[in-house]
């Protein structure tokens, strides 16, 4: 249970985290299991321990083996094992299965490929990405932080994706590569950036002073079940529940699913007994999901009374 497989390529950096974790204040000792020899902590060594991390800078095939980490606290010790294998670099483009990280799936609307293990390293953007050894080029590919986004994913986008980045340790740079497979699934459901159907952006809504008024915020978020989807109103940038005007309340409308399968939500803003000061407020309809937030602003204007005189 507390053993972890780690692998890397010779002459690249490899950083391994102890499978047993504890508070940052706990000391962690590392040993090479075969010889029970302690791993030094001095950074001048090619292989050294740094708290929960074991660093190979760079790695050599001879480093392969099982490493023991012992997390020591005042009241207990916990032992973990890191099974490290360092492979020779392949001369051809083929990445063998034993160098592959977990496969990720994407769909037409959701196509992020995270660079495996990158959070262990001290790296700076941008990442380089390759598919089947070819550098990715074109506007469909966007390297963003620690992941790759592919726009308008097609079945041909399936394949092996390699991220390449530079780890910096005390001014010295070391290359790191990691590869994982990407499969494309034809999803029935999907999520997209919120689309506000109503109100229109910067809409002016005519109201009568002293009467009641309703504003509807309606947005769609994709197709099928949504992890997170919400619509809400804000007044002058403040949530309705915090604004403190009991005449102005919001209530959830009906969840809608149109014939085309889109998942949509309504939120109705009810203003009782409209007052002059309500015309000075900015009304924001917000739609939020895991892709982000979209805001449409509405202002109220006084409806001119109809002149009944000829």
């Amino acid at each position: 249970k507390f053993s972890k497989q780690s692998w890397g390529l010779e002459n690249e950096a490899l950083i391994v985290r102890c499978p047993r974790q504890g508070k940052p204040s706990y000391t962690v000792d590392w040993y090479y299991s075969q010889t029970n020899k302690s791993i030094p902590t001095q950074e001048r060594n090619r292989v050294f321990a740094s708290g929960q991390l074991l660093k190979f800078l760079p790695a050599a095939v001879a480093d392969s083996g099982i490493y023991t980490c012992i997390v020591r606290s005042p009241t207990f010790n916990r032992t973990g094992y890191a099974n490290v294998t360092i492979y020779k670099k392949q001369s051809d483009c083929n990445v063998p299965d034993y160098l592959m990280y977990s496969t990720v799936s994407g769909s037409e609307k959701n196509s992020k490929i995270y660079c495996p293990t990158i959070d262990l390293y001290n790296w700076t953007a941008p990442l380089e990405w390759f598919k089947n050894c070819q550098a990715l080029q074109g506007s469909r590919y966007r390297a963003h932080k620690s992941f790759l986004v592919i726009d308008n994913v097609m079945t041909e986008d399936a394949g092996d994706y390699t991220c390449k980045f530079i780890h910096n340790e005390n001014g010295a740079n070391y290359s790191v590569t990691a590869t994982r497979s990407f499969t494309v699934k034809d999803e029935q459901g999907f999520s997209l950036f919120p689309v506000i159907g109503a109100p229109a952006q910067n809409e002016i809504k005519e109201v009568e002073i002293g009467k009641n008024a309703n504003l509807t915020c309606s947005a769609c978020f994709g197709k099928g079940t949504q992890f997170l989807a919400a619509v809400l109103w804000q007044l002058n940038g403040t949530k309705i529940t915090d604004f403190g005007e009991p005449r102005i309340q919001q209530e959830e409308g009906q969840n809608q699913s149109f014939s085309n399968g889109l998942a949509c939500l309504d939120m109705v803003l009810r203003i009782a007994d409209v007052k002059e000061e309500d015309l000075l407020l900015q009304y924001d309809c917000l739609a939020l999901n895991l892709h982000g937030l979209r805001r449409h602003t509405v202002r109220l204007s006084r409806k001119n009374p109809i002149d009944h005189h000829s």
Partner: nanobody, 121 residues
Framework: EVQLVESGGGLVQPGGSLRLSCAAS????????MGWFRQAPGKEREFVAV???????KYADSVKGRFTISADNSKNTAYLQMNSLKPEDTAVYYC???????????????WGQGTLVTVSS
């Protein structure tokens, strides 16, 4: 821009509880939508919970009934109360805030540095 600082992470036994805090500064807290996300080793960052206003909260299916998100506007702080913790809850937990602009993509949310939660016996 909102600066976010998480705290409260640590090592806890299965079945135990933790309360994470996220202190916000640098912008109007009360108009921001606050959320918690988590990233387990080798996995993608995933949604945990969001508080839209004092009456509206949303949760990932995997934490419903166990986790509770709340916010205290007077302290500019959001909280995540985590009960009945499981080993699979082990992850770095990130606080996030969104507000302000007309359109804000998920990558443009303001993010904290994260706090590690380890659930292990």
């Amino acid at each position: 821009e909102v600066q976010l600082v998480e705290s409260g992470g640590g090592l806890v036994q299965p079945g135990g509880s933790l309360r994470l805090s996220c202190a916000a500064s640098g912008s109007t807290f009360s108009n921001a939508v606050m959320g918690w996300f988590r990233q387990a080793p080798g996995k993608e960052r995933e949604f945990v919970a969001v508080i839209i206003d004092s009456r509206t909260t949303k949760y990932a299916d995997s934490v419903k009934g166990r986790f509770t998100i709340s916010a205290d506007n007077s302290k500019n702080t959001a909280y995540l109360q985590m009960n009945s913790l499981k080993p699979e809850d082990t992850a770095v937990y990130y606080c996030a805030a969104v507000g302000g602009a007309t359109t804000v993509t998920a990558s443009e949310w303001d993010w904290g540095q994260g706090t590690l939660v380890t659930v292990s016996s």
